[in-house]
């Protein structure tokens, strides 16, 4: 299926140009999306092009500036947040990135009613996290690992926790591993729906081993960065959940929420918290061996001022074929009765689907079914449930939004997006206003992305929010590559692939092939999305064919494919890339003497193992920030898929699946190894060990490090990286510079 027709007529050919590397590095062809910042059922905020914060009312069609760009500029604000009572706005400046989600910032409060900044009892700086209560204008914030509460922005703060200590005790914010591998947020505190209670997590990292690496900076001596980071099998953080009454915080103080007995009997994780009502909360827990998850619904006991989690309100989710959930265990979406909920988990056929749980998981009512997967529940209202899936036309790499009418019996299902802009839009997400009165659809491709506003009752399109006209015009004279998404059937395994072909692709000619791989558990690379990136350039200008293949271990095609890699990372992911390459060669247009593979992070691990597979298929390859041994990576992620690195568990495969063990096999390939020295995620240690093993085996290879760069290799390093990799590939493929 050709998703992007070349739009080239012969007469126009000479006015068209290929993509350049400069185009990619400059972000010339980047697109915009429009996510409304909903503040009610029919109103949203948006930052205009001139940086005013504008409030839009869909029903009246009116808009007005609630915060002037002059005010934003006066504190160099890069972000804002309106209090629910609309009286105050916090302005965020001095953004300083920490890890993937976390950052510190300076916060200023602007009083919209008085038209000036709040001066009394100013917030300390830098703050690690700050948020408004869901109602009114209470503030909760984390400063120096402790949580504070303000009843009003100008009031003095009330200190909730006192034991916070850098790298030791974290209150209201996650430690490194919880941030990256469990919560995927910068915060670990949650307001109850009306702001009566504030729940928070406390992480105790006292006994966690520390990863230490040098940060070279500009000083005479490098700094040492120390992060409590549990690698596979190491001691983990100890987590506790507390809830405090924010109306009378000093009255009884924080109350701990009990952990279910079956969880507390051995090492465990807290995975998420969902408020149901002001006096009912739902906590999810996970055993360290991550195939058992417990969802616990707890109620406030007014008489004792404590939280009670009866065993009858514990729901167990267990996997017998792999780990619990997909990448994470899914979170519940509660219905209006405040006890039953909707949740995505595997059905009896091994496909992730929406289930309705009223009393027990065993009696769950399956809401969706089929050989496809429900991916996200966006919103449940009195009469509708909105979700996304990859059901339509059996393409796993698509996302459409569906509505199930739960108010009628039998429930009827409608695809909201399937036929809206069928060629242009096959991969959607959505953002809903209160009560799903309105929603925005954001289409990511395969055509140029477009964001639209819709009526939540009729699904009628109200207006286009962003259609990327400028991008469309800019691309008119660009020779974009062609893209096709197809599948290979091999030994009862379906391998979906995306092939990116040069603009004047001719099946009778031979082209160099580059495999781009990620391949991590529960990932998906073959998606119907728009992108003009480095591989687009390689196809457009350098005439390469690029392929992405979703093999075993990847997501949204059922548990058989997903859990195939359980306890065996580094085997089937690599096999499936190799199998796909052989099939591509059979297609007749690949020059089998010029095949390369590259990947980043997990993809760097897979590309390294593929290069060292001894097949002779690959001439060269690149690994950027690869994992080299699962003993070096984070406990929460690694153990989910690999178990523990102990003799009586899975130590043998931990040892067998390292890149170092295959050092000898790199002798007949050109290998480029790249890593940032300040990588907090996949530590430089991984590449250092690969390099050491290659040196010890006397195998020649190329390497590049990026001083003081993390896992993202951002800024000027990005330009250097892609320029360097381009030269490497062109040399490998004997393409003139």
């Amino acid at each position: 299926i050709v998703l992007r027709p070349s739009r080239v007529h012969n007469s126009e050919e000479n006015t068209m140009r290929a993509l350049t590397l400069k185009d990619i590095l400059n972000g010339t062809f980047s697109y915009k999306t429009f996510f409304p910042n909903w503040i009610s059922g029919q109103e949203y905020l948006h930052q205009s092009a001139d940086n005013n914060i504008v409030l839009y009312n869909i029903e009246t069609g009116q808009s007005y500036t609630i915060l002037s760009n002059r005010t934003m500029k006066s504190v160099n604000a890069s972000n804002y947040g309106l209090s629910p009572d609309r009286q105050f706005v916090y302005l965020e400046s001095d953004y300083s990135k920490l890890w993937r989600y976390s950052y510190t910032a300076t916060y200023y409060i602007y009083d919209l009613s008085n038209g000036e900044f709040v001066r009394g009892n100013e917030l300390p700086r830098p703050i690690q996290y700050l948020c408004w209560s869901p109602v009114g204008s209470k503030l909760a914030y984390v400063y120096q690992n402790n949580i504070y509460l303000k009843q009003r922005p100008g009031d003095p703060p009330f200190q909730i926790t006192f034991n916070g200590r850098e790298n030791k005790i974290f209150n209201g914010i996650p430690d490194w591993v919880y941030e990256e591998e469990m919560l995927a947020t910068k915060y670990a505190l949650w307001w109850s729906p009306n702001g009566k209670f504030l729940a928070y997590a406390e992480f105790n990292d006292t006994d966690i081993p520390v990863i230490a690496y040098s940060y070279y900076g500009d000083e005479q001596y490098p700094r040492t960065i120390n992060i409590p980071y549990p690698k596979a099998g190491a001691k983990n953080p100890v987590v506790r959940i507390f809830i405090i009454d924010t109306t009378y915080p000093a009255y009884v103080g924080p109350q701990e929420v009990p952990v279910p007995a079956m969880i507390a009997s051995s090492d465990y994780y807290f995975s998420w918290l969902t408020w149901v009502t002001d006096e009912r909360v739902c906590l999810q827990w996970l055993k360290r061996v991550q195939n058992v998850s417990v969802l616990s619904i707890c109620d406030f006991r007014e008489d004792w001022q404590t939280w009670d989690c009866p065993k009858t309100q514990e729901h167990i989710e267990e996997s017998r074929t792999g780990w619990a959930g997909g990448f994470f265990v899914s979170t519940p979406v509660f219905s209006y009765d405040a006890i039953s909920y909707y949740k995505i988990f595997s059905d009896k056929d091994g496909y992730k689907h929406i289930h309705y749980i009223k009393d027990t998981v065993e009696n769950a009512i399956q809401i969706t079914s089929g050989k496809w997967e429900a991916i996200n529940i966006f919103r449940v209202t009195q009469d509708s449930l909105f979700y996304s899936s990859n059901e339509f036309e059996e393409y796993p790499g698509r996302r459409n939004i569906y509505r199930i009418s739960i108010g009628s019996y039998p429930p009827s299902k409608k695809c909201v997006t399937c036929h809206l802009r069928k060629e242009r839009c096959q991969y959607y997400t959505a953002s809903f206003s209160d009560y799903a009165k309105y929603y925005a659809l954001v289409c990511y491709g395969p055509g140029i992305p477009i964001s639209t506003l819709h009526d939540g009752r009729t699904d009628q399109e109200i207006k286009i929010l962003e259609e990327n006209k400028e991008l469309e015009n800019a691309l008119k004279n660009i020779q974009l590559p062609k893209e096709e998404i197809k599948k290979l059937e091999v030994d009862e395994i379906t391998l979906w692939y995306k092939m990116i072909l040069p603009p004047q692709f001719d099946r009778s000619k031979k082209y160099p092939l580059l495999i781009q791989v990620y391949g991590g558990p529960c990932s998906q690379s073959v998606r119907s999305v728009f992108a003009v990136n480095w591989i687009s350039y390689l196809a457009s200008k350098e005439g390469m064919v690029i392929a992405l293949v979703d093999g075993r271990g990847t997501a949204f095609q059922g548990d058989k494919l997903l859990y195939a890699v359980y306890r065996k990372l580094g085997v089937y992911e690599v096999e499936d890339q190799i199998t796909a390459v052989r099939k591509f060669i059979e297609m007749g247009f690949i020059d089998e003497k010029r095949i390369a593979i590259w990947g980043w992070s997990y993809g760097g691990y897979v590309s390294s193992l593929a290069l060292a597979s001894g097949t002779g298929l690959f001439k060269c390859g690149i690994a950027v920030a690869p994992v080299s041994s699962w003993e070096y990576y984070a406990s929460v992620y690694t153990e989910r898929f690999m178990g523990l690195p102990t003799k009586d568990d899975n130590l043998e495969h931990y040892k067998n699946s390292t890149v170092m063990a295959r050092a000898e096999y790199f002798r007949n390939v050109d290998y480029l190894l790249i890593h940032g020295t300040a990588d907090d995620n996949v530590h430089f240690q991984n590449s250092a060990q690969i390099a050491k093993a290659l040196v010890n085996a006397q195998v020649d290879f190329q390497a590049m490090w990026y001083s003081d760069q993390n896992h993202g290799l951002s800024g000027l390093s990005t330009n250097h990286l892609y320029t360097h990799m381009t030269h490497f590939l062109k040399q490998c493929f004997s393409l003139s510079d």
């Epitope: 002059r70 038209g115 000036e116 709040v118 001066r119």
Partner: antibody
């Protein structure tokens, strides 16, 4: 010359409500917030509350919260202050005053122009 | 709330003489960010609304005679009339606009001796 012209004197019974208007002219209405201040006989000036004409968001002194409602009609460049559940101690002269909006972090302005005042008498 | 206390409650000064009024705030009205004191002085004559004389503790409003001056820092402030004129007979109020609620002093009545 900037003008803030208030409505005339009112005599009200206890428990009743009063609504005082403040019509402004000769300046850009949306560049200033409007505040209401009262002065009971022999008493100090007492701030009641204010409103931002750009967004219609009011801010009230906690002492009056629940009894006072401040609104604006931007098209008429007029602000209103309504006080309900009147009692004898609400007998006072009620003033409106303007205060420049502070866009910058270092700004902050005093009330530079005041209305002529409206005498509200609460008596049974 | 910030409480403003003026002294004296009343003051009788001969024409041409100096009049000094003090104002004390229960907490600082000095803003560390810009080193400005968020304090104003108003003059109110019988049957008239207050008139702004001084803002930021020491800046004269345009059109205000230079015999009026303000000084002070943090919590202690002074309004000085260097040479009292007959038209200066009025009640003078200090007001903080550092934080809400905005609060006024109880007023100082200035008369001619």
């Amino acid at each position: 010359q900037v003008q803030l012209v208030q409505s005339g004197a009112e005599v009200k019974k206890p428990g009743a409500s009063v609504k005082v208007s403040c019509k402004t002219s000769r300046y850009t209405f949306t560049e200033y917030t409007i505040h209401w201040v009262r002065q009971a006989p022999g008493q100090r000036l007492e701030w009641i509350g204010g409103i931002n004409p750009n967004n219609g968001i009011p801010n009230y002194n906690q002492k009056f919260k629940g009894r006072v409602t401040i609104t604006v009609d931007t098209s008429a460049s007029t602000a209103y202050m309504e006080l309900s559940s009147l009692r004898s101690e609400d007998t006072a002269v009620y003033y409106c005053a303007r205060r420049r909006i502070a866009y910058g972090y270092d700004e902050g302005h005093a009330m530079d122009y005041w209305g002529q005042g409206t005498l509200v008498t609460v008596s049974s | 709330d910030i409480v403003m206390t003026q002294s004296p409650d009343s003051l009788a000064v001969s024409l041409g003489e100096r009049a000094t009024i003090n104002c004390k705030s229960s907490q600082s009205v000095l803003y560390s960010r810009n080193q400005k004191n968020y304090l104003a002085w108003y003059q109110q004559k019988p049957g008239q609304p207050p008139k702004l004389l001084i803002f930021w503790a020491s800046t004269r409003e345009s059109g205000v005679p230079d015999r009026f001056s303000g000084s002070g820092f943090g919590t202690d402030f002074t309004l000085t009339i260097s040479s009292l004129q007959a038209e200066d007979v009025a009640v003078y109020y200090c007001q903080q606009y550092f934080s809400y609620p905005l609060t006024f002093g109880q007023g100082t009545k200035v008369e001619i001796k």
